[in-house]
Interface confidence: low
């Protein structure tokens, strides 16, 4: 940084004088103000005063024309000291070579050069490099050696010396702090290439420097205070859109907002996301709010950017007062599923149970009740009290509607809110068995031979549960015992029917009375087909012939 290439100056220069040759530059000027000076023959020793330096800018000045034949090379020393006179750099050797005269102009390789640099960078940061060529001899003379300079800067904000160009390499660097994309997004520099290392023929080009965005502006809430109204219990409900402004480049990480709920959300009821286009903060409910528990929440939301700030910036905070609106909430049956034991076959009008719901709302709402699903139509429900009564015969043995002794009913509770809301409950009636079914034989049709008849074994079934079942008893009625006998086996679950007298081939009714352990009696008529045959038969053969 604290070096300079040998400076070539053509002899017989016409001036005007003093003439700026090069700028001494110490990067220590970031930290302190620097004063520059030069020493050596041509400066402070004979021939004195040929060269001088602008002590504050470091510009090296030529005070009069040079005579190469008199002196071909000057060796000077550049010094940099702080305000208190302390040396901040080692002395720098400055070589000035007097060159031959020149008759060709330099040419830039492009009409327009383009480069970029981040806003807010420190002085000394390199931006871009420009190049010019010259047809003059650059081996034995400096006629073809090009020196670069900045002719002008547009705009001249915050001042007109924002950039410097390395005179020999063409590297353009930032020389001053204060690059601010939000104020000046682009600079146009008119650059010069001068042969004879800066004092020959000159040509110009344009260098366009784009100032790139850095996250040097914090997003700011506008407005900072919000009031919102949210119905209770709503999940995923948009509460409020929070608007921020950010001077950084739109749609960049330095502009895109990141929102954080800093306080007020004790129950973790809210969440906030960033809208991908508008950059707004969309505050929504993560859980349902409960008006009855808390009707107002005050949230504090902080906004930052996706990209970190490049310097310490104050963050903006918004306050959102969320008013929870009361909503007519559905009544809730207590318990949601109610198990009630009830005897089957209870009389019509007999109460079964009371099944009621509670309303979460604070005001005393009237709840009315209705049966929603009563597959067999056995029940009625008082709309005011929730009293469930029997209006049909509850039958545990009804396989169409009863499963595992349980009859399932769905009931509805409706409040008188506007609009009304409804809740459902399940009533599980466990039907207690009563001895309402007598035993029944199977099969109820038999075929039997009237010669050496085979005993007919009939299974006994009873839809009731123990103890209203076996052991069973059998009895023949209506004179059936004249021709038949009926005996129950030892296990008590089958009846053996035997033909004890000869009957002609025909169909007869056998009146069989079966009773269970609880003496519930059931009379069944067995259709007996008697055939003219011997022993076992399934269907009657043709007419039987004796002999």
């Amino acid at each position: 940084d604290w070096v300079v290439a040998p400076i070539s100056v053509p002899e017989n220069g016409k001036g005007p004088f003093p003439q700026r040759l090069n700028q001494l530059k110490s990067n220590k000027d970031r930290d302190t103000k620097i004063f520059y000076s030069i020493t050596g023959p041509g400066a402070d020793s004979p021939p004195e005063g040929v060269f001088a330096v602008e002590k504050e800018t470091g510009w090296l000045l030529l005070n009069k024309p040079l005579d190469r034949e008199e002196i071909a090379k000057y060796e000077l020393f550049g010094h940099a000291v702080s305000e208190n006179g302390a040396s901040v750099e080692d002395p720098m050797n400055i070589s000035i070579i007097v060159t031959d005269q020149n008759d060709h102009k330099p040419k830039f390789t492009q009409d327009t050069f383009r480069g970029s640099v981040l806003e807010g960078v420190l002085p000394g940061t390199s931006v871009m490099q420009v190049t010019a060529t010259d047809e003059d001899d650059a081996i034995y003379t400096y006629n073809g050696v090009v020196a670069y300079s900045i002719h002008s800067q547009e705009p001249k904000d915050p001042h007109d010396l924002m950039f410097t160009i390395h005179r020999s390499t063409g590297t353009i660097s930032v020389i001053s702090s204060g690059l601010d994309r939000e104020k000046v997004p682009e600079y146009t520099l008119t650059i010069q290439a001068t042969d004879m290392d800066g004092d020959g023929s000159t040509t110009t080009a344009v260098a366009v420097v784009e100032i790139l965005d850095a996250n040097d502006n914090a997003p700011m809430f506008d407005p900072q205070k919000y009031e919102a109204h949210v119905p209770e219990n709503a999940v995923g409900h948009e509460v409020q859109r929070l608007t921020v402004t950010d001077l950084d480049a739109p749609n960049s990480p330095a502009w895109r907002a990141t929102y954080l709920i800093m306080g007020g959300d004790d129950g973790d009821h809210f969440t906030i996301t960033t809208h991908p286009e508008s950059n707004q903060g969309i505050l929504t409910t993560r859980k349902g709010l409960d008006f009855e528990a808390k009707n107002q929440h005050t949230l504090y939301v902080e906004v930052t950017n996706e990209a970190p700030f490049v310097l310490k910036l104050p963050t903006s905070t918004a306050t959102i007062v969320v008013h929870v609106e009361d909503v007519n909430e559905a009544p809730v049956f207590v318990p949601p599923s109610k198990v009630v034991e009830v005897q089957e076959g209870i009389p019509t009008g007999e109460p079964v149970c009371v099944y009621t719901a509670e309303d979460p709302d604070k005001e005393n709402q009237k709840i009315s009740y209705r049966i929603l699903r009563d597959p067999a139509g056995w029940l009625a429900m008082d709309p005011d009290s929730g009293q469930v009564t029997a209006v049909g015969t509850l039958d545990r043995e009804d396989e169409q509607f009863v499963r595992n002794n349980i009859y399932e009913v769905m009931v509805l509770a409706m409040d008188n809110g506007s609009p009304p809301t409804t809740g459902t409950g399940t009533l599980l009636l466990t039907l207690i068995d009563v001895n309402d079914h007598g035993p029944v034989p199977e099969p109820r049709q038999i075929t039997i031979c009237n010669q050496s008849p085979v005993r007919q074994v009939l299974n006994i079934t009873d839809k009731d549960l123990s103890p209203h079942t076996s052991p069973f008893q059998a009895q023949l009625t209506d004179d059936s015992d004249i021709y038949w006998t009926a005996e129950v086996n030892e296990e008590g679950d089958t009846v053996v029917l035997s033909l004890k007298k000869f009957l002609k081939q025909d169909t007869y009714d056998v009146h069989l009375s079966l009773s269970d352990h609880g003496n519930k009696e059931q009379l069944t008529v067995i259709r007996a087909t008697v055939c003219d045959c011997h022993g076992h038969v399934e269907t009657c053969p043709g007419p039987w012939k004796g002999g």
Epitope: S368, R370, L372, R373, P375, G377, A380, D382, P383, D384, M410, L412, P419, P420, T424
Partner: antibody
Amino acid sequence: QVQLVQSGAEVKKPGASVKVSCKASGYTFTSYYMHWVRQAPGQGLEWMGIINPSGGSTSYAQKFQGRVTMTRDTSTSTVYMELSSLRSEDTAVYYCAREGYSSSWYDYFDYWGQGTLVTVSS
Amino acid sequence: EIVMTQSPATLSVSPGERATLSCRASQSVSSNLAWYQQKPGQAPRLLIYGASTRATGIPARFSGSGSGTEFTLTISSLQSEDFAVYYCQQYNNWPPWTFGQGTKVEIK
């Protein structure tokens, strides 16, 4: 068989009230909910409200709240619909409709009255 | 409130042809949808309930299908007595019970 027989046509002046009756027969009156639906000339069907003939509880469409009253008389198996503060746009045929009973929560309308034309005109 | 939308508003069909009427709900009504037929000067008559079950005495040429939000009433071969206005109605969410605006089936 199920029958719903409604009262005859009415002509009313704006601001007046009208009371339409619907007599049910052929089924157990208190076991089925009854609805009222109206149809303006050349228009579609618009639900007005429901009454539970068993307990007399009601629910009305928001549009008619404060203007409509539905009642029942179990001794005659009749439901009534009274609409007050009549205006010309209340000119319509008013139907009673019985709510069917299935295992679903809410039900369709399986039987309808023949309709009562109410004309509101000054 | 669930909004029921029927299409088309008017359907011109020749006798003996097939007619297909559509009904769309603004949100799911499961299978709790009914179709009614209304002839001039008469009360509506229940045709279909539960989206697809024919009511007592309704001819087999009437059939319903669909569930959720999209429903169809099909009349397989139109008879002269079938020319009328047809309404769909949801009974899944109440109040209110809501009807479609109707589809008029007219002779082509």
